[in-house]
């Protein structure tokens, strides 16, 4: 006996169309673009029913339901706006992602997504993944004056990339992006196999303040060319945080130097070092301090560290020096790992040019200079670590 004539569901059609359907005949259902086969909540790629000997179809008719891309995923540090209408997530609906202003900027695309027939929110470039809200780097409440004045107390927002590293000796670092800290290898060498021992604090000016943003380390990456207790060449390390930190006026990453950055780091150009290291009084600073210091000619610095007790070749091409010939302005113990920063006058953003590494036993000594890891030499290394992990 023939099976009942199959009535196509709304927004679908039957194929093949026959006058009647008898034993072993079959039909398939095809949905219009933007509609999908559903049996209840379960999606089907295809649907074919077969006429059975009792004159019934072997399965019930599915629905051709409008494709629903579902609520769009939340964008970390951003928001989503429904353009087509409040809560509309069906075929051809449009949404617009945007990032939290001032502190984040959108990467990858313009943030406009359309619900396509395959059921995925898709950007105008064809991407199905979310855009990225990347922290804006190098923002500071401070603008450089270009002249030297040192031993100043930092004010809120002056050095929002400043990180305090505890868990061994007191050291410093600088926030990169929202989940990495750039520091000196010697400052975290002892914790390289016990990253969780590092107590990382940011968003505070006072070293002993109970008010700070706590971060914990997931992994420590020490440059493979660094040899502990054998000089300070390649004195650079990265700490991966186990969570992203929320960026605000008091916690902002430092920029990495652009290729053109060397033009802002010539001899006598002013960099700024900040930290809670030893002050002239010989104690760790309670308040974050900073000093503006000029870059020193590399040959002059090399010569200053050629005589005993320093071994020949102490200053390498991976280092830069900064300070005054007359002394008095320097970074010191406890500042290790912190950033020596420069203002990129073209982008108007601060970038890290150096990492506080080493210097004379007597900080700020005349004729001696602070020695910093030259960050621009390590951009490929930094980028590789960050992209791989």
């Amino acid at each position: 006996q023939p099976c009942p004539y199959p009535m196509a569901p709304p927004n679908g059609h039957v194929s093949p169309v026959q006058a009647k359907y008898i034993l072993k005949d079959s039909f398939s259902i095809f949905c219009e673009t933007g509609y999908e086969l559903l049996q209840g909540h379960l999606p089907l790629k295809s649907f074919t029913a077969v006429c059975q000997k009792d004159g019934s179809w072997d399965r019930p008719m599915p629905a051709c339901s409008i494709v629903d891309c579902g609520p769009p995923d939340d964008l970390p540090s951003g928001r989503v706006e429904y353009i087509t209408g409040p809560g509309v997530t069906t075929y051809k609906a449009v949404i617009q992602y945007s990032c939290e202003e001032t502190f984040y900027t959108m990467k990858v695309n313009d943030g406009k997504y359309v619900c396509e027939a395959d059921g995925f929110w898709t950007s105008s470039k064809g991407e199905k993944s979310l855009p990225v809200c990347e922290p804006v780097c190098g923002l500071s409440a401070r603008t450089t004056g270009g002249r030297i004045y040192g031993g100043q107390k930092a004010k809120p927002g002056d050095f929002p990339w400043q990180v305090l590293i505890l868990g061994g000796t007191t050291a410093a670092g600088a926030l990169l992006y929202d989940n990495w800290v750039l520091t000196a290898a010697h400052a975290v060498y002892e914790q390289k196999h016990d990253a969780s021992a590092l107590d990382i604090r940011m968003g505070t000016l006072k070293r002993l303040s109970p008010h700070y943003t706590q971060a914990w380390s997931e992994a420590v990456f020490i440059h493979e060319g660094y040899t502990h207790d054998a000089g300070f060449d390649n004195d650079i390390a990265l700490i991966k945080l186990n969570n992203k930190v929320v960026i605000n006026s008091n916690i902002t990453p430092i920029c990495l130097p652009r290729k053109e950055a060397e033009s802002f780091m010539r001899t006598d150009d002013i960099g700024t070092a900040s930290g809670w290291g030893l002050t002239q009084r010989g104690f760790l600073a309670r308040n974050l301090m900073y000093v503006d210091i000029p870059i020193v000619d590399h040959q002059k610095c090399t010569a200053a560290y050629e005589k005993p007790p320093y071994p020949r070749g102490s200053v390498t091409a991976n280092m830069l020096c900064a300070g005054l010939e007359s002394g008095g302005k320097d970074s010191c113990r406890g500042d290790s790992g912190g950033a020596l920063v420069f203002l990129d006058s073209e982008t108007e953003r601060w970038f890290v040019g150096g990492i506080v590494s080493w210097g004379s036993m007597n900080c700020g000594e005349a004729g001696q200079y602070g020695v910093y890891t030259k960050v621009i030499n390590y951009i490929p290394w930094i980028e590789n670590i960050i992209s791989d992990f």
């Epitope: 049996q39 209840g40 909540h41 379960l42 999606p43 790629k45 019930p60 059921g119």
Partner: antibody
Framework: EVQLQESGPGLVKPSQTLSLTCTVS?????????WNWIRQPPGKGLEWIGY???????SYNPSLKSRVTISVDTSKNQFSLKLSSVTAADTAVYYC????????WGQGTTVTVSS | DIQMTQSPSSLSASVGDRVTITCKAS??????VAWYQQKPGKVPKALIY???YRYSGVPSRFSGSGSGTDFTLTISSLQPEDVATYYC?????????FGQGTKLEIK
Amino acid sequence: EVQLQESGPGLVKPSQTLSLTCTVSGGSISSDYAWNWIRQPPGKGLEWIGYISYSGRTSYNPSLKSRVTISVDTSKNQFSLKLSSVTAADTAVYYCAVLYALDYWGQGTTVTVSS
Amino acid sequence: DIQMTQSPSSLSASVGDRVTITCKASQNVDTNVAWYQQKPGKVPKALIYSASYRYSGVPSRFSGSGSGTDFTLTISSLQPEDVATYYCQQYNSNPLTFGQGTKLEIK
């Protein structure tokens, strides 16, 4: 005939992430259907966790959504479950299955959450 | 979430008896209901889909009926191998939900 086989650690510590994989043989995961994860706590009933469809779209149980990720690796013909921040209440037999017009279930894998 | 309430929660019947298990949905689920049989220590096995369609290989003594909110699984002549827990399930909307189960024993 399609066969499904779950694999993954039988013991997970509280607060950690449970990770299971379902390997599909005898058919392609991208050919059709919704590929589901279902669990059954000891001595209790069945609970649907979620599915990933032939096209890669996911649907999750709202009660677990904040902790669940289901993904697919079509090159290996596998789909996977990740359940984060587990507690003792997540101790169960976990099944992968195809529901509706086909009825294929894995044998189930017991996951115990304990320190 | 749609609640699927099964009754009875357990029952005891004799071989050859006609056994009926009911399932009530808390809201309309059309005919998007399946029935499963689970024997102790075993994987659930589907018997019925779309309320009344029997899976191939399932004995004809198993049948399903209903639509909307009320559904029934009937075993026309109970066999010893039918001892199991039976679950109804709706797949009409997210989340897919199961009944709490009906444990069937032989007298």
